[in-house]
């Protein structure tokens, strides 16, 4: 008895695909050893066709794959574009040779079945409509017309011209003639179900003079498309159900034991397990739509089906499309925090991983919104203008070559709570979902700026100080000037760094920035922050208003972001003449529903490449006293 198990007999027809699962005992050795699929020859030799070591034979090139699922103790052999030559005896097995542990599998590939000359074959998918054509001679023009279904020797009437309809075809079958045609009638059967398949006979007239036609109806169940995705990556289900259901509600469901549970539909239903990581996007007016799921989990693996029905729920006899999703736990996508917590008035720094091979790709950050289908408007991107309402408090710091970029959001409010997506215009699998949870602050913020009322006068010297606690002593402190294309680091001076590293006076840890002389273009948002290398930490923001020397009225700040600062101790500061080149990219924030839409956004941004780079000091100069 072999400990390997699988299907002993697999049968299919030419042109189809098979997906053969082989089960092996759950041991560490088995999980990691070579898996193979070989064809048994007459001489007893089993010739390898594909193995987990990367070997692929010539006859399987471009049409087969072998995927190991160590967490399930299974491996799957997929073979597409079957021909009758694939019929034969095979082994699926484990081990360094093809004589190790194995299981015998018989594969039989048949021709598409042929029928007698007088039989018309109709092949339709589940849920579709078939129109059966029935020819008759002029002598039967006024005779009774009927369609019956063969059941053994009997032929049970489905519909006839006396308006009889079999109850199981009620509201699905109609018998009609077209125009002035005197030699043909038609029977439409809609909402086809698997049990409709079989041999039908249509008849005009009675007895020996009757005209009869045979029709073989094949109702095809959808072949599930096999999708292999990595843990934490994303998947897009492209659903094309045809024009006849263009106006019906659409859904994606996951097959459960008893039912197919709706994950999302166009009537606003959404499974809570997919909250924050799903989008349904209509593609066109012909009923095409796509469903994108990000942040794939192990438990997302399974059988999915999309369909259409006015109820937004699966109904027998309505068209469907099917997939089987496999989620590979050996993922190239790093594990990152799925929940980030912040407090009101504070800030968060969110690290977004991306494919390190695509460091030049455009990076984006969008806010998932729970409208009926889910949408994710872009808030910020490497070449995208920051969305209205996020000016001065949101920036994207690209760190080329590191395989990650950082998004910082400060001046947090409870309204910022929700789901956000990291995405690029490159590898679509690298989309991560983050849930931001913002709680009410219970203590004062770690970083505080003085003076609170930051109004600078043109031509004069203006200094702002940022107080930080001792816990940030060893971290790098920085000031940056926020603009639509990032927050550009400025020269600054750290007072705390002068002190002995042994003691830390909580009241005198200060990093300051001086504008000397103040210019009109210095007006805007400034951030004080801490970081360690490329790891960004806490930030706080202040708006610096600039006014003429003669003007007496104080400048009114655009937000209350400056209301938190305290008086600063005296300090010696570094002066910096700050210039800011604002090269704004004109990227409309868009709903990033799938690869194509992201690609479009990327193409648009490519035309507007900005020379400024978030996190760089380009365009600024500093001088020390």
């Amino acid at each position: 008895q072999s400990p390997i198990f699988g299907p002993q007999d697999v049968s299919s027809i030419e042109g189809n695909s098979v997906s053969i699962t082989c089960y092996y005992p759950d041991t560490s050795v088995n999980r990691h050893t070579r898996k193979y699929w070989c064809r048994q020859g007459a001489n007893g030799y089993c010739a390898t066709l594909i193995s987990s070591n990367g070997y692929l034979s010539k006859e399987y090139s471009g049409r087969a794959s072998l995927i190991n699922f160590p967490e399930n103790s299974t491996f799957v052999i997929n073979i597409a574009h079957l021909t009758q030559e694939d019929t034969g005896s095979y082994k699926c097995g484990l081990g360094t040779t093809n004589r190790g542990l194995f299981f015998d599998v018989s594969l039989e590939v048949s021709q598409v079945p042929e029928f007698p000359n007088d039989t018309h074959v109709y092949t339709k998918d589940i849920g579709r409509t078939v129109t059966i054509e029935c020819r008759f001679k002029e002598g039967n023009a006024h005779s009774k017309k009927s369609l019956c279904k063969k059941r053994g020797e009997a032929c049970e009437v489905v519909i006839d011209s006396t308006e009889y309809v079999d109850p199981s075809y009620k509201d699905r079958a109609i018998l009609f003639m077209k125009g002035t045609s005197r030699d043909i009638f038609y029977v439409n059967i809609s909402h086809l179900i698997p049990s409709d398949a079989g041999l039908y006979v249509c008849q005009a007239g009675e007895g020996p003079s009757a005209d009869k036609n045979n029709a073989d109806l094949q109702v095809l169940e959808p072949e599930p498309e096999l999708l292999y995705k990595d843990l934490r990556s994303s998947v897009t289900f492209e659903c094309d159900l045809g024009r006849e259901v263009a106006n019906d509600a659409k859904y994606l469901c996951r097959k459960n034991k008893e039912t197919c549970d709706v994950i999302i539909n166009t009537l606003g239903k959404r499974d809570p397990a997919f909250e924050g990581r799903i989008l349904l996007t209509p593609r066109d007016d012909n009923g095409r739509f796509s469903v994108l799921i990000t942040g794939l989990r192990k438990e997302d693996a399974g059988h999915y089906q999309c369909g259409a029905h006015s109820s937004g729920l699966p109904q027998e006899g309505w068209p469907v499309q099917a997939w089987q999703l496999f989620v590979n736990e050996e993922s190239t996508i790093p594990n990152s925090r799925s929940v980030v917590k912040g407090v009101t008035g504070g800030s968060v720094a969110i690290v977004c991983p991306y494919n390190p091979k695509e460091s030049s790709s455009l990076k984006y950050w969008c806010h998932w919104e729970a409208d009926e289908n889910g949408r994710c408007p872009v808030l910020v991107g490497t070449q995208a203008l920051v969305q209205e309402g996020y000016e001065g408090r949101l920036a994207l710091f690209d760190q080329p070559g590191s395989g990650a970029y950082t998004v910082i959001l400060n001046q947090l409010t409870t309204q910022d709570s929700g789901f956000y997506w990291c995405l690029t215009d490159g590898d679509s699998r690298w989309r991560t979902t983050i849930e931001l949870q913002v709680a009410e602050a219970t203590k004062k913020p770690d970083l505080e700026v003085t003076p609170q009322n930051a109004t600078a006068v043109i031509g004069e010297t203006f200094t702002i100080s940022c107080h930080y606690p001792c816990k940030f002593y060893s971290q790098e402190k920085y000031w940056c000037k926020w603009s639509n294309d990032g927050c550009h680091i400025l020269p600054s001076h750290d007072e705390g760094a002068r002190q002995s590293s042994v003691s830390c006076d909580q009241s005198s840890q200060i990093v300051s920035m001086t504008l000397n002389p103040v210019k009109k273009e210095d007006e805007g948002w400034y951030w004080c922050g801490v970081k360690e290398g490329q790891v960004y930490g806490e930030t706080t923001a202040i708006y610096v208003a600039v006014e003429e020397r003669t003007r007496g009225s104080p400048h009114i700040n655009p937000t209350d972001a400056n209301a938190r600062a305290k008086d600063a101790p005296e300090e010696e500061a570094m002066e910096s003449s700050v210039r800011e080149d604002e090269n704004k990219a004109n990227l409309d924030p868009r709903l990033f529903a799938d690869e194509r839409e992201i690609q479009n956004a990327g193409d648009q941004a490519q035309e507007n490449r900005a020379s400024g780079n978030a996190g760089s000091a380009g365009g600024q100069s500093g001088s020390s006293k």
Partner: nanobody, 126 residues
Framework: EVQLVESGGGLVQAGDSLRLSCAAS????????VGWFRQAPGKEREFVTT??????????YYADSVKGRFTISRDNAKNTVYLQMNSLKPDDTAVYYC?????????????????WGQGTQVTVSS
């Protein structure tokens, strides 16, 4: 809900043949696994055979103890699955249950199946 009804059981001599039928009614799914399990008195329910299908592709799984003797097949138009049992042995005596599932991770595991028939008795005398 799917209802499963088994038929075809009975008393036969060792070496004889028997054909069991499992008729499904109610909600039908596009991808199915229908299997046969058996339970002898005082023993656990054991896997016999399963057929799964996807479109026009069929996969047939058998327990080692019945390989070469039992054959599973299906008639899609009749929503029926058959178990042809040849060369029956006294060890094959048991109540045979038909089971169905829409999602099967491992066809040998009874808990993977959601729908069960009432069972049909097969007795093989020596």
């Amino acid at each position: 809900e799917v209802q499963l009804v088994e038929s075809g059981g009975g008393l036969v001599q060792a070496g004889d043949s028997l054909r069991l039928s499992c008729a499904a009614s109610g909600r039908t799914f596009t991808t199915y696994g229908v299997g046969w399990f058996r339970q002898a008195p005082g023993k656990e329910r054991e896997f016999v055979t399963t057929i799964t299908w996807s479109g026009s592709t069929n996969y047939k799984y058998y327990a080692d103890s019945v390989k070469g003797r039992f054959t599973i097949s299906r008639d899609n138009a009749k929503n029926t699955v058959y178990l042809q049992m040849n060369s029956l042995k006294p060890d094959d005596t048991a109540v045979y249950y038909c089971a169905a599932s829409t999602v099967l991770t491992d066809p040998r595991v009874p808990t993977e199946y959601d729908y069960w028939g009432q069972g049909t008795q097969v007795t093989v005398s020596s």
